[in-house]
């Protein structure tokens, strides 16, 4: 009886269970009653990352420098090239097909997490007691100056965008 299902790493064709090609190789010829499946290695710029019956290998991804991309990991016959973004840029999507500049955190916000090649800057509002008076992709919220430790008093209260202003204590007469 011809098989209706095949083992793992096999496929059914013409009532025959044929071996799939291993990762890094493409199908040249299906198996027959007389022959085993024939596979050939992918060329240098190509890959296949699964057991397969593909007659063509996939082209490695191109990390286009015009889009701000650079190679993070060179592709092999079994893996695709992994792209990342140049310094100061991050990927627009998980597949990293193009890059955009990291965003800066506006005054009143500080950097919670510095951007990487694959993730944007994460900003957070400066909580009470902290401020940021610059637009920056690196600076965290800074604590208000402690006037007391300088033997000074608060002359002007701080905000999330400004530091406190300290001044001398009034002398009692």
């Amino acid at each position: 009886e011809p098989p209706t299902a095949c083992r793992e790493k096999q496929y059914l064709i013409n009532s025959q269970c044929c071996s799939l090609c291993q990762p890094g190789q493409k199908l040249v010829s299906d198996c027959t009653e007389f022959t085993e499946t024939e596979c050939l290695p992918c060329s240098e710029s190509e890959f296949l990352d699964t057991w397969n019956r593909e007659t063509r290998c996939h082209q490695h991804k191109y990390c286009d420098p015009n889009l701000g991309l650079q190679v993070q990991q060179k592709g092999t016959s079994e893996t695709d090239t992994i792209c990342t973004c140049e310094e100061g840029l991050h990927c627009t999507s998980e597949s990293c097909e193009s890059c955009v500049p990291h965003r800066s955190c506006l005054p009143g916000f500080g950097v919670k997490q510095i951007a990487t090649g694959v993730s944007d800057t994460i900003c957070e509002p400066c909580p009470v007691g902290f401020f940021s008076n610059v637009s920056s992709a690196f600076e965290k919220c800074r604590p208000w100056t402690s006037c007391e430790t300088k033997d000074l008093v608060v002359q002007q209260a701080g905000t999330n965008k400004t530091d406190v202003v300290c001044g001398p204590q009034d002398r009692q007469r």
Partner: antibody
Framework: QVQLVQSGAEVKKPGASVKVSCKAS????????IYWVRQAPGQGLEWIGG????????NFNEKFKSRATLTVDTSISTAYMELSRLRSEDTAVYYC????????WGQGTTVTVSS | DVVMTQSPLSLPVTLGDPASISCRSS???????????LHWYQQRPGQSPNHLIY???NRFSGVPDRFSGSGSGTDFTLKISRVEAEDVGVYFC?????????FGGGTKLEIK
Amino acid sequence: QVQLVQSGAEVKKPGASVKVSCKASGYTFISYYIYWVRQAPGQGLEWIGGINPRNGGTNFNEKFKSRATLTVDTSISTAYMELSRLRSEDTAVYYCTRHGNGVYWGQGTTVTVSS
Amino acid sequence: DVVMTQSPLSLPVTLGDPASISCRSSQSLLHSNGNTYLHWYQQRPGQSPNHLIYQVSNRFSGVPDRFSGSGSGTDFTLKISRVEAEDVGVYFCSQTTHVPWTFGGGTKLEIK
């Protein structure tokens, strides 16, 4: 239905070449190898080699590698076997054959090598 | 090259009787994928060969069930349970495990 139709009989002088054709029909030509086998008068069979029409890749019996050329013309679903530097021992019936989901043979082409 | 040796060379059989042909190979025909690529076919006078059995024991579509194949490694047998008049011809074994593919010398089946 699958059919392999071969070219007609040939008579050749020693040292000449012969080119036998095998026209396939009834299936997708590039999906299966075409193999060539010969049978000398009153003898058994001898495998010459095969060609993959998808990419032109060949495999050969070493005995024939220097004299046999296997080619295909996918536009007309035809395979060719050319044998050069013929000698009298090459007198035989030459068959093309295809397997995969059944085995199919051409009707055979008689090649006679005689001075 | 793998040498395929068939016996007997000639096999006279009475109609309705069984027949058996042996084929031995000079090395194992077990492929690394677990298959054994040993095949049988019949050639009637003046005709192209006609395949009967592939991979030791699998009958091709349309082949009568009186034909059966068995064996493993280097030792194989083709059996015809009840010979009919249309079975007259030469029977060959062949192997496609090793390149070059090779053939047995043939067994001529004739009716007594």
